[in-house]
């Protein structure tokens, strides 16, 4: 999918709003130097598309995020604020969703999260130099 | 049963408020959009605006901008629609519509409608 | 004033088909496959018969079909039966300010 034609600062303010804090509520008990950012992103486009596959492509070690609030809620801005968005990507995201079993918050997880929680600042970041 | 049951109607005098109630039962209510949609006796719908619980986020037409206010209670499953400054021409039927979980631009599921009369 | 343009009445006997336009714009129906048909009978609440453009919920017999071409959108009923008398409101998806437009109605009449 293509985030060129998102509505970048509503998905800021409902990433202030309520994202930020279930991505915080999930980190909850780890200190943000208990992991190196190895995943960066250049423009909004960039991060967006960083944030989904992070979110939502499961990897080996970490299958369950896409169960997770913080998950449902950036689908939900994604589908709302990036026209298009549900038709390309809600199927898929879901038959994810419906191939995982456990929900386990493993180290995996936390590290994956807190790489989530950098992509976003940069996403920000990147909508603060454009204004 | 998957329904939307909305409160009953009213009869108002014009400048005041009214408030329609709309209660989800057999569907996560906060991942759907609920929407208000209008119809005045005789005429077509016209849609008023949106609240999707998850993200509390709500979104207005501009015709009802600074004049309605759309909420929800997760914890009852219900969405509320707020109209104030009510003239005559708010005389319809409000109806309550669920858009699709993270598909929020159609309606499968509607209320049964709420008759608000404004009359002096 | 509606946004989106639809004929005030339509009429076929049964068993004819009927096609009921909705003209909008690049902004609304040219620009997104989210167009939605609704059917009202006097004193009911809307349903959903076609959302997507032509995408059927399960329950809406096949004689409903919809389709797009540029910024104009079209139900067609065929076969048509009395109990398809009733009003048709198309609707669209309008971009994340204005969100949902809708047509004026058109009545469909089943002589």
């Known amino acids: 999918y293509d985030f060129t034609n998102c509505d970048f600062q509503k998905i800021e303010a409902d990433y202030l709003r309520t994202i930020s804090k279930d991505l915080i509520t999930y980190m909850s008990g780890t200190k943000s130097t208990d992991f190196n950012n190895t995943v960066s992103c250049s423009n909004r486009p960039h991060c967006l598309t960083e944030i989904q596959s992070l979110t939502f492509n499961p990897t080996p070690r970490c299958a369950s995020l896409a169960k997770e609030m913080f998950a449902r809620k950036t689908k939900a801005t994604l589908a709302l604020w990036c026209p298009g968005y549900s038709e390309t990507q809600i199927n898929a995201t879901q038959a994810m969703k419906k191939a995982r079993k456990s929900k386990v918050t493993t180290n995996k997880c936390l590290e994956q999260v807190s790489q989530l929680l950098g992509l976003w600042r940069r996403f920000i970041r990147t909508l603060l130099k454009k204004q | 049963q998957v329904q939307l049951v909305q409160s009953g109607a009213e009869v108002k005098k014009p400048g005041s408020s009214v408030k329609v109630s709309c209660k989800a039962s057999?569907?996560?209510?906060?991942?759907?959009?609920i929407n208000w949609v209008r119809q005045a006796p005789g005429q077509g719908l016209e849609w008023m605006g949106v609240?999707?619980?998850?993200?509390?986020?709500?979104i207005y037409a501009e015709k009802f901008q600074g004049r309605v206010t759309i909420t929800a209670d997760e914890s009852t499953s219900t969405a509320y629609m707020e109209l104030s400054s009510l003239r005559s021409e708010d005389t319809a039927v409000y109806y309550c519509a669920r858009g699709q979980e993270y598909f929020y631009w159609y309606f499968d599921l509607w209320g049964q409608g709420t008759l608000v009369t404004v009359s002096s | 004033q509606s946004a989106l343009t639809q004929p005030p009445s339509a009429s076929g006997s049964p068993g004819q088909s009927v096609t009921i336009s909705c003209s909008g714009s690049?902004?609304?129906?040219?620009?997104?496959?989210?167009v939605s048909w609704y059917q009202q009978h006097p004193g009911k609440a809307p349903k959903l018969m076609i959302y997507?453009?032509?995408k059927r919920p399960s329950g809406v017999p096949d004689r409903f079909s919809g389709s797009k071409s540029g910024n104009t959108a079209s139900l067609t009923v065929s076969g048509l039966q009395a109990e398809d008398e009733a009003d048709y409101y198309c609707?669209?998806?309008?971009?994340?300010?204005?969100?949902?437009?809708f047509g004026g109605g058109t009545k469909l009449t089943v002589l």
């Open positions: 690049s902004s609304d129906i040219g620009g997104y496959n989210r």
């Open positions: 997507d453009v032509s």
């Open positions: 609240i999707v619980p998850l993200v509390g986020v709500t």
């Open positions: 609707s669209s998806y309008a971009g994340t300010d204005t969100f949902i437009l």
């Open positions: 057999g569907f996560t209510f906060g991942s759907y959009g």
